[in-house]
Interface confidence: low
């Protein structure tokens, strides 16, 4: 069973709290922190020993419209001699952000928040060796 | 994508862009997802350049729960499981949008928030400055 | 499969003191924060109160603080509330329940137990 909203989770509802409809939130979505940078060590999707590379898709009726997703280069790890080493695995790291979706049915527009999966990088990992009997 | 003609006989209310605020469906599309990383898979453990996960908690914004990597050393382990220090474990970053109540306190009232989070690390090649 | 199984409710005169119970399974109970939400006759629902995983930190509403008290046992995948000076507008039906807060929607809920309080 679902429960239906609660008047407030942690604490009582200030009186000033904007009117929502039921079944829906109202989401400002000029974004807070909006100019912050990502300040990562240069240019590490070439230097590490699991690289990668980066894939930009574009959806005009999705908010951010832009989503960057990276891919490994390789199966295997990058070693010291710069050769592909197939005893280890280059493997993707992954994060979940939100985002906000924009739906047209007819002449009206509904919104839909929804969760992305965005690969970020790749790492080095020691493979798991399942041994057969 | 793809985008949606709009019919042309539809009132011209709405901008090509999004509208600063709008009202948004309740039910977050995908929302069941596995978001503990720990559960997800053990790379962090299995990393050539390990980290910790540290959990970061606010009421106040969505996801409620969000785990931030640290990397475990700042050289990278060997074959022979020892830190080599002539390669550096370093964190990878990422901008993620979070929702934050908006004022705060209310039950269905958010703002976007960006936020940037270490997801994990890698291994790289360090950068040499040479001293002339 | 998700349980909760609430349990404690009863008649209890204005004053006097009671305590709820909530038994917890078919999930990993002390990895989540948990929650008592009411429903007077007639109303909506009113969250009560919140204890995080471990334990540690308790949140209420301001019209239980002082009287109500919120603890889990995660050996026991238990989760109490201990109510104090009751008033008859405490009279409800408690519920415990488990699950993220956005939009205020809880995971999964029990069949509630009933508190009366009259004289």
């Known amino acids: 069973r679902k429960i239906p909203k609660v008047g407030h989770t942690f604490f009582q509802k200030p009186e000033s709290c904007p009117p929502v409809p039921g079944g829906s939130m109202k989401l400002d979505i000029g974004i807070i922190n909006e100019n912050q940078r990502v300040s990562m060590s240069r240019n590490i999707e070439s230097r590490s020993t699991s690289p990668w590379n980066y894939t930009v898709t574009w959806d005009p009726n999705r908010y951010p419209s832009e989503v960057v997703q990276a891919q490994c280069r390789n199966l295997g790890c990058i070693n010291a001699q710069g050769k592909e080493d197939i005893s280890m695995n280059s493997v993707p790291i992954q994060q979940e952000t939100l985002v906000v979706r924009r739906k047209h049915q007819g002449c009206s527009v509904s919104f839909q928040l929804e969760k992305v999966l965005v690969t970020v990088g790749c790492t080095c990992v020691t493979p798991v060796i399942h041994h057969v009997q | 994508g793809i985008t949606i003609p709009r019919n042309p006989g539809c009132p011209n209310s709405e901008d090509k862009n999004f509208p600063r605020t709008v009202m948004v469906n309740l039910n977050i599309h995908n929302r069941n997802t596995n978001t503990n990383p720990k559960r997800s898979s053990d790379y962090y453990n299995r990393s050539t350049s390990p980290w910790n996960l540290h959990r970061n908690e606010d009421p106040e914004r969505y996801p409620s729960v969000i785990w931030e990597a640290k990397c475990r050393h700042l050289g990278c382990i060997n074959a022979d499981g020892n830190v080599d220090y002539h390669m550096n474990s370093v964190p990878i970053q990422q901008e993620i949008l979070v929702l934050r109540r908006e004022p705060p306190h209310c039950p269905n009232s958010f703002r976007l928030e960006k936020i940037l989070v270490s997801v994990g690390c890698t291994c790289v090649t360090p950068i040499v400055h040479h001293v002339a | 499969e998700v349980q909760l199984v609430e349990s404690g409710g009863g008649l209890v005169q204005p004053g006097g003191s009671l305590r709820l119970s909530c038994a917890a399974s078919g999930f990993t109970f002390s990895s989540y924060s948990m929650y008592w939400v009411r429903q007077a006759p007639g109303k909506g629902l009113e969250w009560v109160a919140e204890?995080?995983?471990?334990?540690?930190?308790?949140y209420y509403v301001d019209s239980v603080k002082g009287r109500f008290t919120i603890s889990r046992d995660n050996a026991k995948n238990s989760l109490y509330l201990q109510m104090n000076s009751l008033r008859a507008e405490d009279t409800a039906v408690y519920y415990c329940?488990?699950?993220?807060?956005?939009?205020?929607?809880?995971?999964?809920w029990g069949q509630g137990t009933l508190v009366t309080v009259s004289s």
């Open positions: 329940a488990k699950g993220e807060i956005l939009p205020l929607y809880f995971d999964y």
């Open positions: 204890i995080r995983q471990d334990g540690s930190e308790q």
